[in-house]
């Protein structure tokens, strides 16, 4: 079941999925001046069996100005960004991507990929939040959001990470705690 909405945005933070549940789709988007090849896939799909998950289909872009055929996939990490996120300042890795059964790793970039990735998440997907540069976590509460099915509708849980600037934090006495880890999680409301 696809999640109806995007993960929630919260002030001064970005989110990222560490691994993608089977059923997740990634749009094949090309950067300005390029387009999908005529016979190319609209999206990549995370699929798998009990022992292995991987991305089906390949995204391929060609110049809009020519009728060239396919371009080979070559890594361009600087192009690789996720939907509605910015690159993380530090490796926010609460789980090893390869160790999660039923999940795909981050797909490798393709040549002339658009600068933002558009994912379509499924129920059960978890995304992790981190404060942007210049802000820090007020507390090490849960910094993730999970797409849940409640009363027949999908919704994302509210991340409990609060990111404050240095000036703001100084008003509030109390020990500053390190960045969130995935131990305590906001769970779904009681089901119907």
């Amino acid at each position: 079941e696809l999640c109806d909405d995007d993960p929630p945005e919260i002030p001064h933070a970005t989110f990222k999925a560490m691994a993608y549940k089977e059923g997740t789709m990634l749009n094949c988007e090309c950067k300005r001046g390029f387009r999908r090849i005529k016979s190319g896939s609209l999206y990549m799909l995370c699929t798998g069996n009990s022992s292995h998950s991987s991305w089906d289909n390949q995204c391929q872009c060609t110049s809009s100005a020519t009728r060239n055929t396919t371009k080979q996939v070559t890594p361009q990490p600087e192009e690789q960004k996720e939907r509605k996120t910015t690159e993380m300042q530090s490796p926010m890795q609460p789980v090893d991507q390869a160790s999660l059964p039923g999940h795909c790793r981050e797909p490798p970039p393709w040549e002339n990929e658009a600068t933002e990735r558009i994912y379509h998440f499924v129920v059960g997907q978890m995304v992790y939040y981190q404060c942007v540069q210049g802000y820090r976590a007020l507390h090490r509460g849960p910094a993730e959001s999970v797409c849940k099915m409640t009363h027949g509708k999908t919704r994302w849980t509210q991340p409990q990470l609060i990111c404050t600037g240095e000036m703001e934090t100084s008003q509030f006495p109390g020990e500053e705690k390190p960045q969130a880890s995935p131990e305590g999680r906001p769970e779904s409301e009681t089901s119907c």
């Epitope: 409990q160 906001p186 769970e187």
Partner: antibody
Framework: QVQLVQSGAEVKKPGESLKISCKGS????????IVWVRQMPGKGLEWMGI????????RYSPSFQGQVTFSADKSISTAYLQWSSLKASDTAMYYC?????????WGQGTLVTVSS | DIQMTQSPSTLSASVGDRVTITCRAS??????LAWYQQKPGKAPKLLIY???SLESGVPSRFSGSGSGTEFTLTISSLQPDDFATYYC?????????FGQGTKVEIK
């Protein structure tokens, strides 16, 4: 469904102590910030601060720092707001809400009246 | 703290009117703004979050707009149930702050 149920109205004298409660149900109470909000008679809403029930981490608005104390008992899904010495100016309706950003669920409020 | 100022303080209107309430922040809060409705003797109710996102179950006649320092709450066609006090709240800069409220009363 998500519910926050607050303790009943209180009438106190200046100088007395008081502890009011807010019990959550229908969600993982320990893992959501609880926000306390004050509303003095005929006035607007004031953000007092927050508590994270899982470890009782508290943050107070500068206006309320040192005036009140937040606490929580996650084993019974309850947050508390207390005063050690009430003043007449503490007379107000006090709400607990689920945070941390905007408040999607609110308690019904506890009316505290302080009068000699 | 960021100061939130609402205008007008009181607004007289009739059923069916289009009503607009303004909230101004003393500095930019991006889109991190919520709107609440409160009726006498009741707890506030969330209407809008992130400046323009309608909370689940809230009628579509309510809408929010704006970013930075100026925001508006619009009720497209005022209903009898909408006579209440409305508050804005910023949650961009810790600690969060509310506007002083706008009372919508019957003309």
């Amino acid at each position: 469904q998500v519910q926050l149920v607050q303790s009943g109205a209180e009438v106190k004298k200046p100088g007395e102590s008081l502890k009011i409660s807010c019990k959550g149900s229908g969600y993982s109470f320990a893992n959501y910030w609880i926000v306390w909000v004050r509303q003095m008679p005929g006035k607007g809403l004031e953000w007092m601060g927050i508590i994270y029930p899982d470890d009782s981490e508290t943050r107070y608005s500068p206006s309320f720092q040192g005036q009140v104390t937040f606490s929580a008992d996650k084993s019974i899904s309850t947050a508390y707001l207390q005063w050690s010495s009430l003043k007449a100016s503490d007379t107000a309706m006090y709400y607990c809400t689920r945070g941390p950003y905007y408040s999607d669920y609110w308690g019904q409020g506890t009316l505290v009246t302080v009068s000699s | 703290d960021i100061q939130m100022t609402q205008s007008p303080s009181t607004l007289s209107a009739s059923v069916g009117d289009r009503v607009t309430i303004t909230c101004r922040a003393s500095q930019s809060v991006s889109s991190w703004l919520a709107w609440y409705q409160q009726k006498p003797g009741k707890a506030p109710k969330l209407l809008i979050y992130k400046a323009s996102s309608l909370e689940s179950g809230v009628p579509s006649r309510f809408s929010g707009s704006g970013s930075g320092t100026e925001f508006t709450l619009t009720i497209s066609s005022l209903q009898p149930d909408d006579f209440a006090t409305y508050y804005c709240q910023q949650y961009s800069s810790y600690s969060w702050t509310f506007g002083q409220g706008t009372k919508v009363e019957i003309k």
